[in-house]
Amino acid sequence: MTKEYQDLQHLDNEESDHHQLRKGPPPPQPLLQRLCSGPRLLLLSLGLSLLLLVVVCVIGSQNSQLQEELRGLRETFSNFTASTEAQVKGLSTQGGNVGRKMKSLESQLEKQQKDLSEDHSSLLLHVKQFVSDLRSLSCQMAALQGNGSERTCCPVNWVEHERSCYWFSRSGKAWADADNYCRLEDAHLVVVTSWEEQKFVQHHIGPVNTWMGLHDQNGPWKWVDGTDYETGFKNWRPEQPDDWYGHGLGGGEDCAHFTDDGRWNDDVCQRPYRWVCETELDKASQEPPLL
């Protein structure tokens, strides 16, 4: 409530008090009342009424001005609100679009970063492979140019492990034919000298009967590369070797192979099993430097 309204209310209260004074029984008249009695009172009342009227007029005028201003303000505010709402709406739409664009850009950026990362990894792999192939190629070239007696790197499609190269067949041959194949490749059927090598070979051949470079065709068991059998590593299945004659193929069992669980068994040398070739890398050799 404005100050003017408060003042007006205050005057109304005073007037009602005044009426009550007139209706009541005549009280003792002090000095003030005597001064204010008769025509003076009328004049005073008229003066007050006039003052009150002026005040009311002033206030009314001010009020209508205020109302006008308020209306104007309301209108301005209404326009402002509408305009602001429109702007806010527009901004929120733009904001939504910007947000969507931001999200789209973010996901694009993320994708590009991912693609870039993948490309980088792929490129690194290719570079690594290229370096490896280049090294292998330069080594193969050196081997071709040399007399072939010393090997400084594994041939293509052979697996290097602990300074040896291994080749795993995917077809089957009789033991002697497999042995010949390895020799043609300047290698020999695999000679297993440790539990570690056993595990490596087993991992690559899986649960498949596979010939190794161990036989007793001339009497005692012998490794094809001359490694001593008696003092060396062995991994026979229980009760093996048994030189079994009950297979009906003639003769006993003179050739050793890895069985499905990796342990060794002796079998008829004519059976067409897979095989593993092995060749040692030249002890003194170093990898050729890349030019």
């Epitope: 007399n147 072939g148 007696s149 041959k173 009789a174 002697a176 034919d177 042995d179 010949n180 194949y181 020799r183 043609l184 490749e185 300047d186």
Partner: antibody
Framework: QVQLVQSGAEVKKPGASVRVSCKAS????????IHWVRQAPGQGLEWMGW????????NSAQRFQGRVTMTRDTSINTAYMELNRLRSDDTAVYYC???????????????WGQGTLVTVSS | DIQMTQSPSSLSASVGDRVAITCRAS??????LAWFQQKPGKAPKSLIY???SLQSGVPSKFSGSGSGTDFTLTISSLQPEDFATYYC?????????FGGGTKVEIK
């Protein structure tokens, strides 16, 4: 043109050794396998073994293992076959033959030497 | 070892005849088969490799066919210089083995 020229005829006593040579010309000696094949009088052909001239790697038929030694000298493009502990049934003409260049063609012969007669007689 | 069986072991034919010699392997050898011609006192001469491929310099009257276990050498028109002994040989497996030979004689 490709030629394989073998050493002359030999007469040996049982228990002795014989060494037959095979000189190659007209091609890259280290690029092809060399095989040794023998033929007893009036009989068929019998394969003895091979040598890989570039590496010196060899293999022989089981019946000759421990008795036959195959070597080569790349400086003079010559392959050698030595047979030990000769018996009378080793009397035969011994041939060298050029094999293929790869593991796939190792046993394919295209050119043969003229043969060397080895007679084992007491 | 793979056994190679040739048939016939000998045959008589006239000049101009078409002659066929067969060779059977004791197991599948694919197309790893060669044919040789040998004349008395001479070294064998290579005619056919890989069952049907002609060695360079060998006349086209010689042809080879077959795969697996059964193979044939055919001489389309026999000439006087073709009278000789013919051998087949497998190169599929160690040890390399030869057929017993087929002697082609003049009738």
């Amino acid at each position: 043109q490709v030629q394989l020229v073998q050493s002359g005829a030999e007469v040996k006593k049982p228990g002795a050794s014989v060494r037959v040579s095979c000189k190659a010309s007209g091609y890259t000696f280290t690029g092809y396998f060399i095989h040794w094949v023998r033929q007893a009088p009036g009989q068929g052909l019998e394969w003895m073994g091979w040598i890989k001239p570039n590496s010196g790697g060899t293999n022989s038929a089981q019946r000759f293992q421990g008795r036959v030694t195959m070597t080569r000298d790349t400086s003079i493009n010559t392959a050698y076959m030595e047979l030990n502990r000769l018996r009378s049934d080793d009397t035969a003409v011994y041939y060298c033959a050029r094999g293929g260049t790869t593991v796939a063609t190792w046993g394919v012969f295209d050119y043969w030497g003229q043969g060397t007669l080895v007679t084992v007689s007491s | 070892d793979i056994q190679m069986t040739q048939s016939p072991s000998s045959l008589s034919a006239s000049v101009g005849d078409r002659v066929a010699i067969t060779c059977r392997a004791s197991q599948d050898i694919g197309n790893c088969l060669a044919w040789f011609q040998q004349k008395p006192g001479k070294a064998p001469k290579s005619l056919i490799y890989s069952a049907s491929s002609l060695q360079s310099g060998v006349p086209s009257k010689f042809s080879g066919s077959g795969s697996g276990t059964d193979f044939t050498l055919t001489i389309s028109s026999l000439q006087p210089e073709d009278f000789a002994t013919y051998y087949c040989q497998q190169s599929d497996s160690y040890p390399l083995t030869f057929g017993g030979g087929t002697k082609v004689e003049i009738k």
